[in-house]
Interface confidence: low
């Protein structure tokens, strides 16, 4: 907490400029008007303030806006954003995607911090749903963002937003998250032709039910083993040997290498040995 002291004669700041880096903390507190700071926030990032000086500037804004900063200030916080606590951010009402992008840029290259997570949460809640533009932005900064959401939160993602999802965005999703995302993807891509559809839906198939896998097996999709191994065990179990053979196409030979792993192991155990023998892979049920 900086002591309240009078501003020395001639030191009253008329604008936010580089001369302020020579001010001691108490001088910044006494000589910089909070309202001036708020209107010239865009200049702060161009000035090499120390962390201690930034603390003073934050303190001044906190005093000016005890109920939370207005978006006009938030958009220009820049590196001062790194000084904010999740509690500070919970007071904000961020509605502009440009503001979100500006603050995410400050944290770029780093893990998602509690501050960023709170900011995103406030933004998405303010919008009411995770629209395509927001999802595009968030996954660009944080490829794992989608998989950081709970299944309940994912349920608010509209199918139209699924077009923004890239395969790498789903890398860390757990099975229950894919259970929620898959039906949305199926709806989003429903008007695509067979081969294009499979390319798009492939990343989401960890949430696919048996009947959809059976349908895919009739379309010569040649699913790779990596995708097959991510399928739900309970969805794979009812598939016949012929259906798995059609689903995998030339990749069916890879079953041998995966015979001790789920879901292949569980599937093999439920097949008749004479059916397995038709594959010529030496699989033992």
């Amino acid at each position: 907490e900086v002591e309240k002291t009078a501003c020395p004669s001639g030191k009253k700041a008329r604008e936010i400029d580089e001369s302020l880096i020579f001010y001691k903390k108490w001088e910044l507190e006494a000589c910089v008007d909070a309202a001036l700071l708020a209107t010239q926030m865009d200049r702060v990032n161009a000035i090499p303030f120390t962390y201690e000086q930034l603390d003073v500037l934050k303190h001044k804004l906190d005093e000016l806006y005890p109920q939370g900063y207005p978006e006009s200030v938030i958009q220009h916080l820049g590196y001062l954003f790194l000084k904010m606590s999740p509690e500070d951010i919970r007071k904000w009402n961020v509605t502009s995607l440009e503001t979100l992008k500006a603050l995410l840029e400050v944290n770029k290259g780093h893990e998602m911090s509690p501050q960023v997570a709170t900011l995103i949460d406030r933004f998405v809640k303010g919008r009411g749903q995770l629209d395509k533009d927001t999802l595009d932005t968030l996954t660009a900064f944080y490829p794992g963002y989608l998989c950081s959401l709970s299944p309940e939160e994912l349920s608010s993602v509209p199918p139209s937003s699924i077009w923004a999802v890239r395969p790498q965005d789903l890398d860390t999703c757990d099975p229950r998250q894919l259970d929620v995302l898959y039906p949305k993807a199926r709806l989003a891509f429903q008007n695509m032709n067979g081969s294009e559809y499979f390319v798009k839906i492939q990343s989401f198939l960890g949430g696919a039910p048996t009947e959809d896998l059976k349908a895919l097996s009739q379309q010569n999709v040649s699913m790779d083993l990596a995708t097959f191994m991510k399928l739900r065990t309970d969805a794979v179990l009812p598939l016949t040997v012929a259906e798995v053979q059609k689903l995998l196409g030339p990749h069916v030979e890879g079953l041998k290498a995966e015979e001790r792993h789920r879901p292949v192991r569980d599937w093999i155990l439920r097949q008749r040995q004479d059916d397995l023998d038709t594959l010529g892979l030496g699989l033992q049920g």
């Epitope: 794992g144 099975p175 065990t233 569980d266």
Partner: antibody
């Protein structure tokens, strides 16, 4: 085969934080197929799911406990952990760690550890 | 949250009896229903997953059936080691929830 072992203090004071660790042996906490859960059972009562974590660090908590729970994973030690803050006597229970397989069932459980909240 | 209601809460039976325990979900959970057996001082043990699939190593006298909201666990011929408490659990959506349990006692 995969085995789970809980460890941590058996006595925690009210308002403090309960911390437990589950060590996975004979398998990997980094398995893409599995979710790692904490479940508790107060004396003489039924089972309550606390939350789970995926190898990637993605978590899902029971809303009734969400504000007090943190589950984390340490893939280098093949462990996952539970922290429950601001405990009261109502948090006295046997705490189990369990593996939820791809079939959606808890197929492997630790033996459980009794945690008593008392001053 | 999905509520799981088990009935009866307890029952008395003799060795060799056929025992049926029911579990009802407050909304449809497809086939995402598991059954566990718990003995005093021990961790629960998985018996049935996905409503009707028998877990490896579990005796075939245990069977499960049902889909949607109504499920049944059947023990075709009760054995001395089967006296325990049985729990159902849904894995359809989070929070994952358990039934209140059914205690099977010796008559």
């Amino acid at each position: 085969q995969v085995q789970l072992q809980e460890s941590g203090p058996g006595l925690v004071k009210p308002s403090e934080t309960l911390s437990l660790t589950c060590t996975v042996s004979g398998g990997s906490v980094s398995s893409r197929d599995d979710l790692w859960s904490w479940i508790r059972q107060p004396p003489g009562k039924g089972l309550e799911w606390i939350g789970y974590i995926y190898y990637s660090g993605s978590t899902n908590y029971n809303p009734s406990l969400k504000s007090r729970v943190t589950i984390s994973v340490d893939t280098s030690k093949n462990q996952f952990s539970l922290k429950l803050s601001s405990v009261t006597a109502a948090d006295t229970a046997v705490y189990y760690c369990a593996r939820e397989g791809k079939n959606g069932a808890f197929d492997i459980w630790g033996q459980g550890t009794m945690v008593t909240v008392s001053s | 949250d999905i509520q799981m209601t088990q009935s009866p809460s307890s029952l008395s039976a003799s060795v060799g009896d056929r025992v049926t325990i029911t579990c009802r979900a407050s909304q449809s959970i497809s086939s995402y229903l598991n059954w566990y057996q718990q003995k005093p001082g021990k961790a629960p043990k998985l018996l049935i997953y996905a409503a009707s699939s028998l877990q490896s190593g579990v005796p075939s006298r245990f069977s499960g059936s049902g889909s949607g909201t109504d499920f049944t666990l059947t023990i075709s011929s009760l054995q001395p080691e089967d006296f325990a408490t049985y729990y159902c659990q849904q894995s359809y959506s989070t929070p994952l929830t358990f039934g209140g349990g059914t205690k099977v006692e010796i008559k």
